[in-house]
């Protein structure tokens, strides 16, 4: 399986909400020996690969902000944790999971990274990860809301 | 904080079973892997085998003909049971959390349990 | 399964000076690799995951490096409490295994 992002780039203003998003691509193992540990954080470009390094997103860690089930179910985060944080992350049937930040500020800009174990019992993990980037700005220079950036093209969208 | 207390008899007569469990306090045990890992006298790490939030179990290849971990969520506790001791079995038994694609983050503080007789 | 093997299995060395301690691993962990801390009578305490990086609370004076089968463990200046015993530990497959473990002993 993949781990797609559709966005590599949100611009957002300060004070906006935004919901970073992930997509779990391919065929997905749905026996009863293979589970998924999804979760996000932040992270840099570093030198031994893209989202090695694994930051606190608003002071939550990775472990915080997890999501455990098996296959294509729906889960979400501990909702009281993440929410005094304003933060939230959900997972659906489609193998679409996102996490959402609410009332954007200039420290929130960097780099993200969701990432998806897929757990194999007896066999092994396998872990594939995706990157995209945040930047928060302000000021007159900064959009009215945010400008999504797909992946595949600079071409870009802006979400209302 | 999560944090993990082992418990059990700290003397086990040979060919008997060797029964621990361990109590997780201050979090869910709804998550994660829950493992047990040993350490003989005076030597290293061996891990033992995990039971997952949902159930599901992996077990060293080595012991696993003599291994069963269990779990009851309703008392945030998980269990050990090794059966056929003999001497070679005597070590500290530590209970630990494993995250997925990270580590061992956090242990108990250990039981020694002595097979003897 | 794979085995960890991790030398020198004793470093003399007093406080202030430099450890450099070494994990090869019998097939490549990829970077998946993690190094505790053991001292006398208690648990071992997570320093680095993922060969490099350093678990919450961990001093600056840890550091790790490697990736595939050799790997490295430094401690760049000991401090007194730094004296314990090391293990590497890989986790691309299972069953998980320790390597032997490194002494740091004060010289």
């Known amino acids: 399986f993949k781990v797609a992002t559709p966005y590599s780039l949100y611009v957002c203003p300060e004070g906006q909400n935004v919901t970073l998003t992930c997509r779990l691509l391919g065929p997905v193992d749905k026996g009863h020996d293979v589970t998924f540990y999804k979760t996000w954080y932040r992270s840099s470009r570093g030198e031994v690969q893209t989202c090695s390094e694994r930051r606190p997103i608003r002071q939550l860690t990775f472990q915080d902000l997890h999501l455990h089930h098996g296959g294509h179910q729906a889960a979400q985060t501990s909702h009281d944790l993440a929410q005094r944080h304003g933060l939230e992350s959900a997972s659906d049937h489609h193998g679409n999971f996102s996490i959402t930040m609410r009332n954007l500020t200039l420290l929130d800009s960097g780099l993200y990274c969701c990432l998806v174990v897929e757990i194999r019992h007896h066999h092994s993990e396998h872990r594939v990860h995706g990157a995209m980037e945040l930047q928060v700005q302000t000021g007159k220079d900064a959009p009215s809301n945010c400008v999504v950036y797909p992946s595949s093209s600079q071409d870009s969208e802006q979400i209302t | 904080q999560v944090q993990l207390q082992e418990s059990g008899p700290g003397l086990v007569k040979p060919s008997e079973t060797l029964s621990l469990t361990c109590t997780v306090s201050?979090?869910?045990?709804?998550?994660?892997?829950w493992s047990w890992i040993r350490q003989p006298p005076g030597k290293g790490l061996e891990w033992i085998g995990y039971i997952y939030y949902s159930g599901s179990t992996n077990y060293n290849p080595s012991l696993k003909s003599r291994v069963t971990i269990s779990v009851d969520t309703s008392k945030s506790q998980f269990s050990l049971k090794l059966s056929s001791v003999t001497a070679a079995d005597t070590a500290v038994y530590y209970c630990a959390r494993d995250i997925p694609a990270f580590a061992f983050d956090i242990w108990g503080q250990g039981t020694m349990v002595i097979v003897s007789s | 399964e794979i085995v960890l093997t991790q030398s020198p299995a004793t470093l003399s060395l007093s406080p202030g000076e430099r450890a450099t301690l070494s994990c090869r691993a019998s097939q490549s962990v990829n970077y998946y690799l993690a190094w505790y801390q053991q001292k006398p009578g208690q648990a071992p305490r997570l320093l680095i995951y993922d060969a490099f990086n350093r678990a919450t609370g961990i001093p600056a004076r840890f550091s790790g490096s490697g990736s595939g089968t050799d790997f490295t463990l430094t401690i760049s200046s000991l401090e007194p409490e730094d004296f314990a015993v090391y293990y590497c530990q890989q986790r691309i497959s299972w069953p998980l295994t320790f390597g032997g473990g490194t002494k740091v002993e004060i010289k």
């Open positions: 201050g979090g869910s045990i709804s998550s994660y892997y």
